[in-house]
């Protein structure tokens, strides 16, 4: 599963340019006076994506984000000056960075921002119905944002607004030291975690908050916070980070004497995401970056997807781990972590645990405790001194479902879509990175549905410049993905079946659960459609089984074979470029001598060097002339991509061309020129670097001389010039548009 083989590379890799050209990305490149498009709120009902940014809140149309409304919500000049005088950066810190954006009720949103290190909140009217088209700030009513938004824009807030109450994990002070989980708004007194107690929270960084029911009784509902924090001394030797899941009961109103206006049901457990390493030492991915909850039929048991990175600066890696809520609950019902003093190791608590068990929500379900204020002193005391569980939560199958350690990027965000395919449901992950790319990954069962293998379908660059993806939302209704970064917002479809190709096999090889071969094209798969007409194989991506009745080999279904003629010079080198669209495909070359039917496999050696981009033929001989066939082989299916006819020009021929008197009739040049076809392409740079002819310093010199004569001939015979010039122009364009593997910095042939 972790081998960095072909399965670990994206099958398709699309640059930003390619995404734009194929209309697969829509970007909002931000406003000149804004940035930090990090806070997302998806409203499928109104078909809007609300985005909180620097001094602005946006309302984007989910169909097309180019259509948007905006609210400007800056801070006053006074506030900005106070912030500046406090030694903060006027551009990066002394502004109103929106950190909280939540649905408050049917008609309003609740928004909070840093307010230039003076957190502030207000309500935003959005109307009852989508057609109301209302989007306005309630500027007559501002509230203190302390305990809701951080002061510092660099810090995140994890928040959740339910039943008019805001749960938020954030820093509650100017210095960014007093981190807490708060409940504010509503009619009750604000509640928070215990202050100045590192056993509860130790310099945490909050990721997200989610309401998850515990039973069918809403009194048992819990709010779960995901965060990372410094490991407490004794938990780990040296400074380390731990990923955490924390729980609190929705109906926690604090204690009656101890923990007054503090959570009495707060518990936390470590989330493990690691792989076994050499010497029995596990490699841990501890820096939790993002969490996504995939809802199941049972609302009590969503699947938790977590994105993690390594803490090490030397070894950079990312992983995705999946957790089940039953495992989480099992840990919260297990032993509490206990130690007798700061110099002692943490051990599982062996003593008597008070009743009701700390962390249990007061309800009719569990013993009739009406409120946390009714809990006996021993429960509160125990809860105060034992906020952490001893056992960690291990991922499903005890290992990550995906890791990446061999790349120059790290994962930052994740959203997951559950897709109905021909043979069951598949979870498709969209993973954001710190270089502005999105990975599309599908979890495919190997032998069983429990043993998953990750198939990396695509790597898409969604922003022009490399930028950290800091927010992602997925609209199942619109079948679109929305991505946020400092630079702006991007929108892309969840599926683009047509990009896979025009043949059944190509569609099948793609292994995209969204797509299937419908008999004539690769298109969106709908489970309701007639099954017999749909071809799909997500599990194995085997076209031989699923498409064999349609095509036994290749090129039968609209796949036009590209043909080219290339001229090489004897004793020099030439490059035959061929790179399949799929990075998973293996390239297989065959050679066919002139006037022969027999094809032979090309043997690589000193004379022929194989590169990722194609074949490099060194020290060309006349016998190298012939047809070169480039095939892509993937999962047993072979497709011919290209037929290159190589003509090797002998040295004598070349000498004639070079040393012929300028006034000569140029017949040889004419012969060479006229034999070229529009699909030709000469790789001049490879010639320049590798040619070694006694009378020729560079291929450029050769070309210059050919062109000089050609120009002379055109002057002498004006009627001939047009065709030749167009011929070369076509070649130039065909080079530009050929495919992503062609290095953009390589010089194309100059027009003749």
């Amino acid at each position: 599963n972790y081998a960095n083989g072909k399965n670990n590379v994206p099958r398709l890799k699309l640059s930003y340019k390619e995404m734009l050209e194929s209309n697969n990305v829509i970007t909002f490149n931000g406003l000149a006076n804004s940035s930090s498009y990090h806070t997302f709120l998806l409203d499928e009902e109104r078909s809007r994506l609300y985005v909180g940014a620097k001094d602005h809140i946006f309302s984007f149309n989910l169909v097309n984000i180019k259509d948007f409304q905006k609210i400007v919500w800056p801070v006053s000049y006074t506030r900005r000056d106070e912030c500046k005088w406090a030694g903060k950066d006027i551009l990066k810190e002394c502004a109103n960075f929106i950190k909280v954006l939540k649905a408050y009720n049917q008609t309003h949103l609740y928004a909070c921002g840093t307010g230039a290190f003076h957190p502030i909140c207000t309500y935003i009217e959005v109307g009852h119905h989508p057609e109301d088209n209302i989007f306005k700030l309630q500027d007559s009513h501002f509230e203190n944002g302390r305990g809701k938004s951080p002061y510092d824009p660099k810090l995140l807030t994890a928040s959740l607004l339910i039943d008019g109450e805001l749960y938020s994990g954030t820093a509650a002070d100017f210095m960014g030291r007093d981190f807490a989980i708060f409940r504010t708004l509503g009619h009750h007194h604000p509640i928070r975690t215990e202050q100045h107690d590192s056993r509860w929270l130790n310099d945490p960084r909050f990721i997200s908050a989610h309401l998850i029911p515990e039973s069918d009784n809403p009194e048992d509902d819990k709010v779960y916070f995901f965060f990372r924090e410094n490991a407490i001394d004794g938990e780990h030797s040296g400074k380390a980070t731990h990923a955490r899941i924390g729980q609190i009961c929705k109906n926690d109103f604090g204690g009656h004497r101890s923990l007054v206006n503090k959570w009495t049901t707060f518990l936390k457990a470590r989330l493990i995401c690691s792989v076994p390493g050499p010497n029995g030492i596990d490699t841990h991915f501890d820096e939790l970056q993002d969490v996504f909850l995939m809802n199941s039929k049972d609302p009590k048991n969503p699947i938790v997807y977590g994105v993690f990175t390594t803490s090490s600066n030397i070894f950079k890696g990312s992983a995705v781990c999946m957790y089940s809520m039953s495992d989480v609950r099992r840990v919260f019902l297990g032993p509490y972590a206990h130690r007798d003093g700061p110099n002692y190791q943490w051990v599982p608590y062996q003593g008597r645990v008070p009743y009701p068990r700390p962390g249990t929500c007061p309800s009719k379900t569990f013993g009739g405790f009406d409120s946390t204020k009714d809990l006996p002193d021993d429960v509160i005391t125990f809860a105060r001194s034992h906020p952490a569980m001893y056992n960690p939560v291990f991922p499903i199958n005890n290992r990550p479902i995906m890791i990446k350690t061999d790349v120059n990027y790290q994962f930052t965000q994740i959203v997951v879509d559950r897709v109905d395919a021909e043979d069951g449901q598949y979870d498709v992950m969209f993973i954001g990175t710190d270089v502005g790319t999105v990975l599309k990954v599908v979890s495919v069962p190997k032998e069983t549905w429990h043993d998953l293998e990750e198939v990396l379908l695509e790597e898409m660059t969604v922003f022009r410049e490399p930028t950290t993806i800091s927010a992602m939302e997925l609209s199942t209704k619109q079948q679109q993905l929305y991505i946020g970064s400092t630079a702006g917002v991007a929108q892309l479809p969840l599926h683009r079946c047509d990009i896979y190709g025009k043949a059944c096999a190509e569609c099948c090889l793609a292994r995209d659960p969204y797509c299937a071969w419908d008999g004539s094209s690769c298109s969106r798969y709908f489970p309701t459609a007639k099954r017999r007409t749909r071809r799909q194989d997500i599990r194995n991506g085997d076209p031989l089984t699923h498409c064999s009745d349609l095509q036994h080999h290749d090129n039968h279904h609209g796949h036009s074979l590209e043909e080219r003629i290339i001229y090489g010079v004897e004793n020099s080198s030439t490059f035959l470029e061929c790179s399949p669209k799929s990075q998973r495909a293996l390239v297989y070359w065959q050679f066919q001598r002139r006037n022969e039917d027999r094809k032979e496999e090309i043997r690589v050696g000193d004379h022929i060097i194989r590169t990722e981009q194609g074949l490099l033929l060194r020290s060309l001989q006349k016998k190298d002339s012939g047809n070169y066939l480039c095939h892509a082989v993937e999962h047993g299916f072979m497709q011919t991509l290209l037929k290159v006819t190589l003509e090797v020009i002998d040295t004598e021929h070349l000498e004639e061309l070079l040393h012929k008197d300028d006034d000569g009739d140029g017949s040889k040049t004419k012969e060479m020129s006229s034999s070229m076809t529009p699909s030709q392409k000469v790789w001049y740079r490879d010639f320049m670097q590798l040619i070694n002819h006694p009378n020729l310093n560079t291929m450029d010199e050769f070309c210059e001389q050919v062109w000089k004569r050609d120009r002379k001939q055109r002057r002498q015979r004006p009627g001939h010039s047009q065709g030749s010039s167009n011929k070369w122009k076509h070649m130039q364009e065909s080079k530009k548009g050929r495919n992503r593997r062609t290095h953009e910095f390589e010089r194309a042939p100059r027009s003749v």
Epitope: Y355, P376, T381
Partner: antibody
Framework: EVQLVESGGGLVQPGGSLRLSCAAS????????MSWVRQAPGKGLEWVST????????YYPDSVKDRFTISRDNSKNTLYLQMSSLRAEDTAVYYC??????????WGQGTTVTVSS | EIVLTQSPATLSLSPGERATLSCRAS??????LHWYQQKPGQAPRLLIK???QSISGIPARFSGSGSGTDFTLTITSLEPEDFAVYYC?????????FGGGTKLEIK
């Protein structure tokens, strides 16, 4: 004024049963934990049982567990202690007490239970 | 269970004198300790809650201190009505337990 009045004490044979009652007044009964504490003749105090506000859960020491049952009727402002399988060592004055979540702030005058053959 | 040990078992003092009663817990109980006074033929009465919190209606001469395992009840100037038995009780964890009592008698 807070008042707690116990009743139901008396003489009972070993193995027998008895039900004590405590009528509460002067405070919102359903807002407090309630407890029973006993004192054997010439001895110290011993906690017997505590019931939470709703009546949904109760606590007991090992010495009376499975033999004594505390209950309450919030609509009648009354606390009960059902005692069965009584032993000679259960002979004591039984006090009805307000509290048990924290300190026990109000005590009744007590009712005497004598277990003897 | 948590065992509370009171000392001395009996304390003989004269009115006007200062009384210092001790209660020691077998394990740390924070400040979850309460003091009661019981006179012959009467029910106990709460004097101090949570180690040091005074109770309304209780004279100011009664005060409590301590936390963890060692606690003290102090009566600054004894009055004739103060001669009684004093009990400490822990509310830290079930089962709740009482100390054996200290009998304060007139010398």
């Amino acid at each position: 004024e807070v008042q707690l009045v116990e009743s139901g004490g008396g003489l009972v044979q070993p193995g027998g049963s008895l039900r004590l009652s405590c009528a509460a007044s002067g405070f919102t009964f359903s807002s407090y934990y309630m407890s029973w504490v006993r004192q054997a003749p010439g001895k110290g105090l011993e906690w017997v049982s505590t019931i939470i506000k709703s009546g949904g859960y109760a606590y007991y020491p090992d010495s009376v567990k499975d033999r004594f049952t505390i209950s309450r009727d919030n609509s009648k402002n009354t606390l009960y202690l059902q005692m069965s399988s009584l032993r000679a060592e259960d002979t004591a004055v039984y006090y009805c007490v307000r509290g048990g979540q924290g300190a026990m702030d109000y005590w009744g005058q007590g009712t005497t239970v004598t277990v003897s053959s | 269970e948590i065992v509370l040990t009171q000392s001395p078992a009996t304390l003989s003092l004269s009115p006007g004198e200062r009384a210092t009663l001790s209660c020691r817990a077998s394990q740390s109980i924070g400040d979850y300790l309460h003091w009661y006074q019981q006179k012959p033929g009467q029910a106990p009465r709460l004097l101090i809650k949570y180690a040091s919190q005074s109770i309304s209606g209780i004279p100011a001469r009664f005060s409590g201190s301590g936390s963890g395992t060692d606690f003290t009840l102090t009566i600054t100037s004894l009055e004739p009505e103060d001669f009684a038995v004093y009990y400490c009780q822990q509310g830290y964890s079930f089962p709740y337990t009482f100390g054996g009592g200290t009998k304060l008698e007139i010398k």
